[in-house]
C-alpha cells in the first residue's frame, strides 16, 4: 500500500496473508467463510501457508494469530494466466477458523459498486514503488471507486466488467504484495487487489480490482460443492 497508514488493530479480522517458506508474504487474501478464503487467481501456488489474526508482517508470534494450510485452491474457470479477467480464487483451509475479535469472515457484496463509493483497501505490500519496502504492520488506505469510463480511459482495451478501478490522489495505491487482499465498501467485500500501473501510484493510473459482485453465485456454489 503506497501512502496508506497503519490499520487500527482488530479492524480487519478477515485479512489473511499467504506465505511461502520461510514466512515470506506473497499475497493477501480474505476470509469469506469459516473455512474459505478469497484471493486473486494470479496468487495460485502449489504449497503455501495461511496466516490470520496477525497484525505485523514479521513472523513474531501474536496471541490472536491462527495458522492454516491451504488444502484446495479453486481458481475461477474464466481466469487465464497471466491475464486479469476473472481474477479470483477460492482457497479451502485445512480446518475451520476459531472466530475471535481478530479472525472473522466478511460478507461478499452482491451489489456492484457505483462511482464515488468510499472504500478501504488493506495489505502488507510494499510501501514504495518501483523499489520495494515492506511495512512493519498492516496498512490501510481509503480509496474511491471510479466510473467504468474513467477506468477504461486509464487502461484502454484492458478493462472488462470483471474489474473496477479505484484510487485517490496521485501517490496512493495498492502495490506488490497486496494482490488478493480486500477492498471493503460499506462493510462488505467489494473487490480484491488485482493489478495496476507499473510502478504503482502513478498519476491517473488507478488500482484495478476484481469486481466481486459479478461472482457471488460462483462463490456460493463453489463453497457448497466443496464443503
Amino acid at each position: 500500500i503506497i501512502n496508506g497508514s497503519d490499520c487500527d488493530m482488530h479492524t480487519q479480522p478477515w485479512q489473511a496473508a499467504l506465505l511461502l517458506r520461510p514466512n515470506q508474504l506473497y499475497c493477501g487474501a480474505v476470509l469469506v467463510h469459516p473455512q474459505w478464503l478469497l484471493t486473486a487467481a494470479h496468487c495460485r501456488k502449489k504449497v503455501f501457508r495461511v496466516r490470520l489474526g496477525h497484525y505485523s508482517l514479521s513472523p513474531v508470534y501474536e496471541s490472536g494469530q491462527q495458522m492454516f494450510q491451504g488444502v484446495k485452491s479453486i481458481p475461477h474457470p474464466g481466469y487465464s494466466h497471466p491475464g486479469h479477467s476473472n481474477d479470483l480464487m477460492l482457497i479451502k483451509l485445512n480446518r475451520r477458523i476459531r472466530p475471535t475479535k481478530d479472525v472473522r469472515p466478511i460478507n461478499v457484496s452482491s451489489h456492484c459498486p457505483s462511482a464515488g463509493t468510499k472504500c478501504l483497501v488493506s495489505g502488507w505490500g510494499t510501501t514504495k514503488s518501483p523499489q520495494v519496502h515492506f511495512p512493519k504492520v498492516l496498512q490501510c488506505l481509503n480509496i474511491s471507486v471510479l466510473s467504468q469510463k474513467r477506468c477504461e480511459d486509464a487502461y484502454p482495451r484492458q478493462i472488462d466488467d470483471t474489474m473496477f478501478c479505484a484510487g485517490d490522489k496521485a501517490g496512493r495505491d495498492s502495490c506488490q504484495g497486496d494482490s488478493g487482499g480486500p477492498v471493503v465498501c460499506n462493510g462488505s467485500l467489494q473487490g480484491l487487489v488485482s493489478w495496476g500501473d507499473y510502478p504503482c501510484a502513478r498519476p491517473n493510473r488507478p488500482g484495478v480490482y476484481t469486481n466481486l459482485c459479478k461472482f457471488t453465485k460462483w462463490i456460493q456454489e463453489t463453497i457448497q460443492a466443496n464443503s
Epitope: L20, Q24, L25, Y26, C27, A40, H42, C43, P82, G83, H84, G125, T126, Q131, V132, F134, Y155, P156, R157, Q158, S174, C175, Q176, G177, D178, S179, G180, V193, S194, W195, G196, D197, Y198, P199, C200, R202, R205, V208
Partner: antibody, heavy 124, light 107 residues
Framework: QLQLQESGPGLVKPSETLSLTCTVS??????????WAWIRQPPGKGLEWIGN???????YYNPSLKSRVTISVDTSKNQFSLKLSSVTAADTAVYYC????????????????WGQGTTVTVSS | EIVLTQSPGTLSLSPGERATLSCRAS???????LAWYQQKPGQAPRLLIY???SRATGIPDRFSGSGSGTDFTLTISRLEPEDFAVYYC????????FGGGTKVEIK
C-alpha cells in the same frame, strides 16, 4: 510463441545518441501482465540492467544511466525503443531486450523471454 | 545500489557432479525478488529460477535455488553436458542489479 528482435545501427560515434528498437512478434505489447526491458553486456563482462517500460508508457531506469536514457513504446507497431545519449566507448556492448511478467503479488518473476541481442560499438 | 557478489568466479567440475553456486548481497534482499539466469557463449541469458526457489517454465528439476536475506544458492544436482555455462543472479528488490557471474566449466 513470443519472440523479441533488436535492431539498430551497429556503430555509433562518441557523443552521439544510440538508438535501438525491439520488435515483439507472437504476442502483444499492450498487455497489463508484462513489462519490457533493456539490458546490456559489455564484451567479456556481466549483465547490466538499463530500464523497463510498461505498456502504458511508465518507465523505470537504472539510476546510473537515468540522465542519458529514454525508453519509449509504440503499441501500434508492437515495438519499444531505447535511446542512450552522449555515448562513449564504455557503452560498447551487446544490447538485449526482454520481457518480464508483472502483477501485484510480492514475487519477482524474472525476465523470461529475451531477444538474441545486437552488438553496438562506439567508435569514431 | 545492492551489489551481488558471486562465488566462485569459476567452477571446474565433471559431468554428473554437483555444482553449488553462491550469490551474496551487500544488503538484505527479500527472497521473493531474486532470480538466476544461465548464459551460454553467443546466446542471450535464460531464466532458470525466480523468487529464489521457483523453477521457470521448462527448467529441469536438477536446478534448484535456495536462500534468504543476503545469501542465496543455485544448485545443479547432477551436471549434464549442456549445463556448462555462465550463471548470473539478479535482484529486483531495489534498482535491479546482476551478480558478476560464475562460470561452470568442464574439468
Amino acid at each position: 510463441q513470443l519472440q523479441l528482435q533488436e535492431s539498430g545501427p551497429g556503430l555509433v560515434k562518441p557523443s552521439e545518441t544510440l538508438s535501438l528498437t525491439c520488435t515483439v512478434s507472437g504476442g502483444s505489447i499492450p498487455s497489463s501482465s508484462y513489462y519490457w526491458a533493456w539490458i546490456r553486456q559489455p564484451p567479456g563482462k556481466g549483465l547490466e540492467w538499463i530500464g523497463n517500460i510498461y505498456y502504458s508508457g511508465s518507465t523505470y531506469y537504472n539510476p546510473s544511466l537515468k540522465s542519458r536514457v529514454t525508453i519509449s513504446v509504440d503499441t501500434s507497431k508492437n515495438q519499444f525503443s531505447l535511446k542512450l545519449s552522449s555515448v562513449t566507448a564504455a557503452d560498447t556492448a551487446v544490447y538485449y531486450c526482454a520481457r518480464g511478467e508483472y502483477d501485484r503479488s510480492a514475487l519477482y518473476y524474472g525476465m523470461d523471454v529475451w531477444g538474441q541481442g545486437t552488438t553496438v560499438t562506439v567508435s569514431s | 545500489e545492492i551489489v551481488l557478489t558471486q562465488s566462485p568466479g569459476t567452477l571446474s567440475l565433471s559431468p554428473g557432479e554437483r555444482a553449488t553456486l553462491s550469490c551474496r548481497a551487500s544488503q538484505s534482499v527479500s527472497s521473493s525478488y531474486l532470480a538466476w539466469y544461465q548464459q551460454k557463449p553467443g546466446q542471450a541469458p535464460r531464466l532458470l529460477i525466480y523468487g529464489a526457489s521457483s523453477r521457470a517454465t521448462g527448467i529441469p528439476d536438477r536446478f534448484s535455488g535456495s536462500g534468504s536475506g543476503t545469501d542465496f544458492t543455485l544448485t545443479i544436482s547432477r551436471l549434464e553436458p549442456e549445463d556448462f555455462a555462465v550463471y548470473y543472479c539478479q535482484q529486483a528488490f531495489s534498482s535491479p542489479t546482476f551478480g558478476g557471474g560464475t562460470k561452470v566449466e568442464i574439468k
